[in-house]
């Protein structure tokens, strides 16, 4: 998954079309419905942090 302009997301993150930015794949075990989770690795890290501010 890549950001517009061919700027790739860093390792462990994936592009969210719903937010127009890279998002941390670590949140996907908690909320797999997020659009960016489709672009995350099949086996995300066991420890993840929430994305709340």
């Amino acid at each position: 998954e890549q950001a517009p302009g061919n700027a790739p997301c860093s390792s462990g993150s994936s592009w969210s079309a719903d937010l127009d930015k890279c998002m941390d794949c670590a949140s996907c075990p908690a909320r797999p419905h997020s659009d960016f989770c489709l672009g995350c690795a099949a086996a995300p890290p066991a420890h993840f942090r929430m994305l709340w501010p």
Epitope: S16, A17, D18, L19, D20, M23, S27, A30, R31, H33, S34, D35, F36, M50, L51, W52, P53
Partner: antibody, heavy 120, light 108 residues
């Protein structure tokens, strides 16, 4: 101060159309996802539609899919909802709301609402 | 869609009372649960996000707890301005965001 001001509501016949606007001020509009939420008279809240900061991604509740279109003009700090093929059950107060900057998390600021009445 | 069920649908309480409102999800939603307050003729106001985080500017008498399927909004000491309708909202099953049916807090 963050402000969201809806306009465009009114009385329309079944099958008719309306375009709602939501003018944003007091914050930088372009980085935020935006939503429309509605509330039928005396009823609870129903999420209607979502649009990404760039406007490239949109989502709709099943009840309005194919009839409503959400859009935004970041140069004008304005959110829109084009409502076509209106039905009596679309009668409600329509609120625009600012989404959180993570992912569909919450609605931290709301407009005062605009009433849409669909009746013959 | 995930269904959100609030209880009670209404309650009567006095100023100074401790008030508890519950919200149950039809399936686990982790901590993706928010609470709003709505007064008649006004827009909803965000009180609590992520189940237990207090929104900026909201009085500390409001608190939230829970995870999974069961959540609680507590008002530790009800004030006159707290008489309103309260809604829970899940943001787990995106984009199918859903709200509870509301709990109306009335003056006893």
């Amino acid at each position: 101060e963050v402000q969201l001001l809806e306009s465009g509501g009114g009385l329309v016949q079944p099958g008719g159309s309306l375009r709602l606007s939501c003018a944003a001020s007091g914050f930088t509009f372009s980085p935020y996802p935006m939503m429309w939420v509605r509330q039928a008279p005396g009823k609870g809240l129903e999420w209607v539609s979502y649009i990404s900061p760039s406007g490239g991604s949109t989502h709709y509740a099943d009840s309005v899919k194919g009839r409503f279109t959400i859009s935004r003009d970041n140069s004008k700090n304005t959110l829109y909802l084009q409502m076509n093929s209106l039905r009596a059950e679309d009668t409600a107060v329509y609120y625009c709301a600012r989404g959180g900057d993570t992912y569909f998390d919450y609605f931290d600021y709301w407009g005062q609402g605009t009433l849409v009445t669909v009746s013959s | 869609d995930i269904q959100m069920t609030q209880s009670p649908s209404s309650l009567s309480a006095s100023v100074g009372d401790r008030v508890t409102i519950t919200c149950r999800a039809s399936q686990s939603i982790s901590s993706y649960l928010n609470w709003y307050q709505q007064k008649p003729g006004k827009a909803p106001k965000l009180l609590i996000y992520a189940a237990s985080s207090l929104q900026s500017g909201v009085p500390s008498r409001f608190s939230g707890s829970g995870s999974g399927t069961d959540f609680t909004l507590t008002i530790s000491s009800l004030q006159p301005e707290d008489f309103a309708t309260y809604y829970c909202q899940q943001s787990y099953s995106t984009p199918g965001i859903t709200f509870g049916q509301g709990t109306k807090v009335e003056i006893k």
